[in-house]
Interface confidence: low
């Protein structure tokens, strides 16, 4: 087993709004639970993006989530992961 | 599942504050919501708010937005309420709770403190 | 806020009966991510309160199978197939999906 990288980054999308992205990295095996949550909740899925998991070469994947959240609400959401029974949580950064 | 040990009863003077301490062990405390609620005798329960220890952010039931600030110390795995101009109506048991959340379930509170006795009085 | 009303005030029973405990909420608790957080705790006399179901259906760890929950939309039941003198303390009902979150007035379980 590999655990993954996670890595959150922030964009600017629309006025008022920002774009929240989660990035696993450099895991194995391939099974991994990677979603947002607002005040500890996940996220219904239509209001999250996710990329598909994908080899990135080195004999681990990668994969990614994001979601669209209002600027100044950044501390309600974290980004939850879960991979081979370990798990982690990791708050958008100021 | 770990441990939440708060602070022992308190006595005190209306107008003033009181800082309430939940010590968590057992868990990683960075990973984690812990939430402060109020009981007075013989009543219900009100959630207060809760903070997410890994960046102290925070989410208040707006009642309790002037007189509840919750703080944490990741260095001692520790959770702080600081409650401010107290009344009587303050008198109550505060507890802390841990949310649990593993994959995609979650309950609010699972885990509990055993609560500390506030009492506002002259 | 989400006012949760509980009934009845008091539950008398006799050890190895059946009891249900009622719930409502005074608007839907659907999460917007399409879950409904309704929880029920157990709190005996000087104790902590205990989580027993949570998600209206899911036992937490531990919590005997006698133990059951049910409902949605704005009607919930927690039932509790024989009781057990360990069964008898005050009940809570408790929506987590709006802020801010509320707990419902409880319900006393005692020795009839």
């Known amino acids: 087993t590999v655990p993954p990288m996670v890595n959150v980054t922030r964009s600017e999308a629309s006025e008022g709004n920002i774009t929240v992205t989660c990035r696993a990295s450099s895991f194995y095996p391939r099974n991994i639970i990677l979603t947002w949550r607002q005040d500890g909740a996940s996220l219904s899925h239509d209001t999250q993006q996710w990329g598909d998991v994908l080899p990135d070469g080195n004999g681990t994947y990668q994969t990614w989530v994001a979601t669209r959240i209002c600027r100044g609400e950044e501390q309600r959401f974290t980004c939850y992961m879960e991979h081979s029974g370990n798990h982690s949580t990791h708050p958008v950064p100021s | 599942q770990g441990q939440m040990q708060q602070s022992g009863a308190e006595l005190v003077k209306p107008g003033a504050s009181v800082k309430l301490s939940c010590k968590t062990s057992g868990f990683t405390f960075s990973d984690n919501y812990i939430s402060w609620l109020k009981q007075k005798p013989g009543q219900s329960l009100e959630w207060i708010a809760w903070?997410?220890?890994?960046?102290?952010?925070?989410s208040y039931n707006q009642k309790f937005t002037a007189k509840a600030q919750l703080t944490v110390d990741t260095s001692s795995s520790t959770a702080y309420m600081q409650f401010s101009s107290l009344t009587t109506e303050d008198s109550a048991i505060y507890y802390c709770?841990?949310?649990?959340?593993?994959?995609?379930?979650?309950?609010?509170?699972?885990?509990w403190g055993q609560g500390t006795l506030v009492t506002v009085s002259a | 806020d989400v006012l949760m009303t509980q009934t009845p005030l008091s539950l008398p029973v006799s050890l190895g009966d059946q009891a249900s405990l009622s719930c409502r909420s005074s608007?839907?608790?659907?999460?917007?991510?399409?879950?409904?957080?309704l929880e029920w705790y157990l709190q005996k006399p000087g104790q902590s309160p205990k989580l027993l179901i949570y998600?209206?259906?899911n036992r937490f760890s531990g919590v005997p199978d006698r133990f059951s929950g049910s409902g949605s939309g704005t009607d919930f039941t927690l039932k509790i197939s024989r009781v057990e003198a360990e069964d008898l303390g005050v009940y809570y009902c408790?929506?987590?999906?709006?802020?801010?979150?509320?707990f419902g007035g409880g319900t006393k379980v005692e020795i009839k």
């Open positions: 709770a841990r949310h649990d959340y593993y994959g995609t379930s979650g309950a609010w509170f699972a885990y």
């Open positions: 998600k209206v259906s």
């Open positions: 408790f929506q987590g999906s709006h802020v801010p979150w509320t």
């Open positions: 903070i997410y220890a890994g960046t102290g952010g925070t």
């Open positions: 608007q839907n608790i659907v999460h917007i991510n399409g879950n409904t957080y």
